[in-house]
Interface confidence: low
Amino acid sequence: QLTTESMPFNVAEGKEVLLLVHNLPQQLFGYSWYKGERVDGNRQIVGYAIGTQQATPGPANSGRETIYPNASLLIQNVTQNDTGFYTLQVIKSDLVNEEATGQFHVYPELPKPSISSNNSNPVEDKDAVAFTCEPETQDTTYLWWINNQSLPVSPRLQLSNGNRTLTLLSVTRNDTGPYECEIQNPVSANRSDPVTLNVTYGPDTPTISPSDTYYRPGANLSLSCYAASNPPAQYSWLINGTFQQSTQELFIPNITVNNSGSYTCHANNSVTGCNRTTVKTIIVTELSPVVAKPQIKASKTTVTGDKDSVNLTCSTNDTGISIRWFFKNQSLPSSERMKLSQGNTTLSINPVKREDAGTYWCEVFNPISKNQSDPIMLNVNYNALPQENGLSPG
């Protein structure tokens, strides 16, 4: 059976296509090619008489066609208008005709696409952004890339318009991109230049650094404020509610106790119209903000009841501190047998009784801090009473 084959089937615009003929019958008088799916004299491209080896152009000949003795037809410099069906009519010597129809598709070489956006400065959690891949062309596949990766599955990402439009619902600050679109058809492919989004957001709640609360008199107070924001936030400082200055950093040299108070950082984003504040308490004091853990020692840890006495000592290197004592979570002294001396550093128990056995610890403190020692265990023994007969046990 007479058949035709297009080589290639998908042709790039400006290239050439060869309509090959298979199973050509013997004893031929000639053949003709027609544009379309049927024989139509008005749409004849070329006729060929085998006897004279003469090719005769028809009404549909564009000058780009070449017919070969084997009936194949070459069309050069194809255009999209050449897309479609082509019919070969073979005239046999017995004047009985045979026909075969083939087709091919011409696609344009795709241009470099570009991305248009309906909003290049969206506001976080408020605006949606629609990207459109230009130009719109027929028989084209559209693909999108974010951060050089294919689109993640996300309810906030929607494709429409034959994948030509990518919509970001409720943008976040992480949606800056870059975004690229790729267009493809069977004969070519091209990708756009990257496009980035300028997402407006913030300010977030500001952070004041450093985190220190306590400062000694004479030190320099240097505070810095930062809030994530686009465009960058504008900052101002208030001390005890009174405006000080519009800067990101606050510097006060040689502070005194009078500089204690509430320090407020105010961050403002003029585009989003949002404000955020953070308050930090600063305490200027001679006292140590961190009291070291005291050490507790006992003159003995095992004593004889009603006979021995014991001294417990609480040691610390800190100055300006006070000391208190605890026994079984009770504050001491709790009886006349217990005495505190040397600024409460020493607890004396004289004499020790059975009820004094247990855990003791001391605590050192100042108005702004405190710390307590590890506990120490006091054991109280009693000598065995003599037997009624005066004999020792044994």
Epitope: K112, L143, W145, N148, Q149, S150, P152, E180, E182, A189, N190, R191, P194
Partner: antibody, heavy 127, light 110 residues
């Protein structure tokens, strides 16, 4: 017609060296990123190395890093794979492959897949 | 052990629909396009599906690709004897800085 033709395979002893070539025709070689992929007898495909269209960016599989070197000569339309310190486990058919999209269209083309492959060249490492 | 996981074999009778799965992670399939390759016996691999689901010209529409999360699949409908081949999935892996293949699936047409 777009074609890739590998050569340079053969029998080599463990520890030896071999240089594979891949001659490209039918397309603008200098516009495409290229890869080497190998297939051990009866096994699956294993990506070996990738080189950008101009040779400025290169990646290797961990299994060949430090032993194999990929390069290209765009003036000769040829891709190369220099293989040193060969081991028995390097025995395979080595294919060169062309990236699907031209670099002019792509910023990170290694995500696009390989659309044209050579017929392969067999490398046998044995004593 | 391949980075992408495929079943070693699959089979079907002529005219049937067969699906081959490919499982990966967020560093490869989850964040990149998947490509499928067909390797007929004794020949070099051939590009079958690119960008998760797109067919190059010349590949019959009986072949289709899809992806969900970190898994991809290749479906072949109207199975034919000439479809008997090895099928491989592939993707770029950002954490490995390299291209990774599945172990391959041998499709038998019964």
């Amino acid at each position: 017609e777009v074609q890739l033709l590998e050569s340079g395979g053969g029998l080599v002893q463990p520890g030896g060296s071999l240089r594979l070539s891949c001659a490209a025709s039918g397309f603008t070689f200098s516009g495409y990123d290229m890869s080497w992929v190998r297939q051990a007898p009866g096994k699956g495909l294993e990506w070996v190395s990738w080189i950008s269209y101009g040779g400025g960016s290169i990646y290797y599989a961990d299994s060949v890093k430090g032993r194999f070197t990929i390069s290209r000569d765009n003036s000769k339309n040829t891709l190369y794979l220099q293989m040193n310190s060969l081991r028995a486990e390097d025995t395979a058919v080595y294919y060169c492959a062309k990236d699907r999209l031209p670099q002019k269209a792509v910023r990170h083309s290694y995500a696009n897949g390989m659309d044209v492959w050579g017929q392969g060249t067999l490398v046998t490492v044995s004593s | 052990q391949s980075v992408l996981t495929q079943p070693p074999s699959a089979s079907g009778t002529p005219g049937q629909r067969v699906t081959i799965s490919c499982s990966g992670s967020s560093s490869n399939i989850g964040n990149n396009y998947v490509t499928w390759y067909q390797q007929l016996p004794g020949t070099a691999p051939k590009l079958l599906i690119y960008a998760d689901s797109h067919r190059p010209s010349g590949v019959p529409d009986r072949f289709s690709g899809s992806k969900s999360g970190t898994s991809a699949s290749l479906a072949i409908s109207g199975l034919r004897s000439e479809d008997e081949a090895d099928y491989y999935c592939g993707a770029w892996d950002y954490s490995l800085s390299g291209y990774v293949f599945g172990g391959g699936t041998k499709l038998t047409v019964l």
